[in-house]
Amino acid sequence: SGTTNTVAAYNLTWKSTNFKTILEWEPKPVNQVYTVQISTKSGDWKSKCFYTTDTECDLTDEIVKDVKQTYLARVFSYPAGNVESTGSAGEPLYENSPEFTPYLETNLGQPTIQSFEQVGTKVNVTVEDERTLVRRNNTFLSLRDVFGKDLIYTLYYWKSSSSGKKTAKTNTNEFLIDVDKGENYCFSVQAVIPSRTVNRKSTDSPVECMGQEKGEFREI
């Protein structure tokens, strides 16, 4: 049902990385506008993105209140210029999103190697602890703050002269690895949440190699 001029939204999709969370949908509006509502399973509906002609709505501010909650959104369709108009059943057309649990489903953003330092045959590689939009006591939390030991990093490292990638893992943001003296190595890291079944891995960080400015070499 609904007015002859409105169509229900469809293909409602959550796009979320490091908790920055946007709901997207189709179609591009023709003579209609949208309003989005979001709620937890047990909570009240809250309206966002009022009467918009966009087909996306940033819901980050709502989901970061409790990233372990499960959220549901719905998108209402209204005739443009007549938002009071409703469908034949007395309600505007709307479509529900899939459920979304940020802690379990947000994609892990591409990590960054902050630095690496070689001392003799040991290299310490440090991963940047990315800031999220999740707040506690008015402070933005880092990815490590939010996920704790649920988050690990996998380091891939290889001699510049070879292709085989050795791996190391850490449940902190630092690696200490053994390397061969006199060899240059390249590094890439991947964030992983092993306890997940989907979205377990991030994309790989940009590759950093020894002899570039991020690193420091100390012969002892």
């Epitope: 996998t154 990638k165 893992k169 992983v192 092993p194 079944t197 989907v198 979205n199 891995k201």
Partner: antibody, heavy 120, light 107 residues
Amino acid sequence: EVQLVESGGGLVQPGGSLRLSCAASGFTISQYWIHWVRQAPGKGLEWVGYIDPYNGYTYYADSVKGRFTISADTSKNTAHLQMNSLRAEDTAVYYCARDYGSFRVQLDYWGQGTLVTVSS
Amino acid sequence: DIQMTQSPSSLSASVGDRVTITCRASQDVNTAVAWYQQKPGKAPKLLIYSASFLYSGVPSRFSGSRSGTDFTLTISSLQPEDFATYYCQQHYTTPPTFGQGTKVEIK
């Protein structure tokens, strides 16, 4: 239910080639890592190599480097072990195993194995 | 590569016995050590991970411990289904390496 099923084993002459497959179900290989481990008759376990199907990164044991290649077909949720220039000492049961990828757990699920015999 | 030296290579024991198998790493591997059980013609099965954690579904008579670079698998009271070969493995560095195995036989 997580399952790994190897196939493609058989008898091959020295210098020959063989391609083993590891079909995974119950999980998505690109979200994990796949290892190959072999066991010569009456001997212990020997690690062969791994692949991260997400980015294609691999690493091999020195004993097979340059002769064996691990690949993954994420659309078919399958990993492969291409074995070239086979030698008698490559005769073994070949297992694929899932790497859970955590700081604490590595090889949590294994296939049943497939026997490769290199003999003239 | 890190060597994992496992001992004994075989042992004979009776049902109800307490059995201890040890593995020594050639260098520090933190707690990145697993223990597997393998029966003839079958794939290895994970028993213990991270040196001392019991894997899901594994009977509590199995336990693991670490002292420096020495790792121990203990079966507190051997059962008939425990007669098998046991392997330790380190995954602290690439390549991962296995111990030579310990065959537990019926006395």
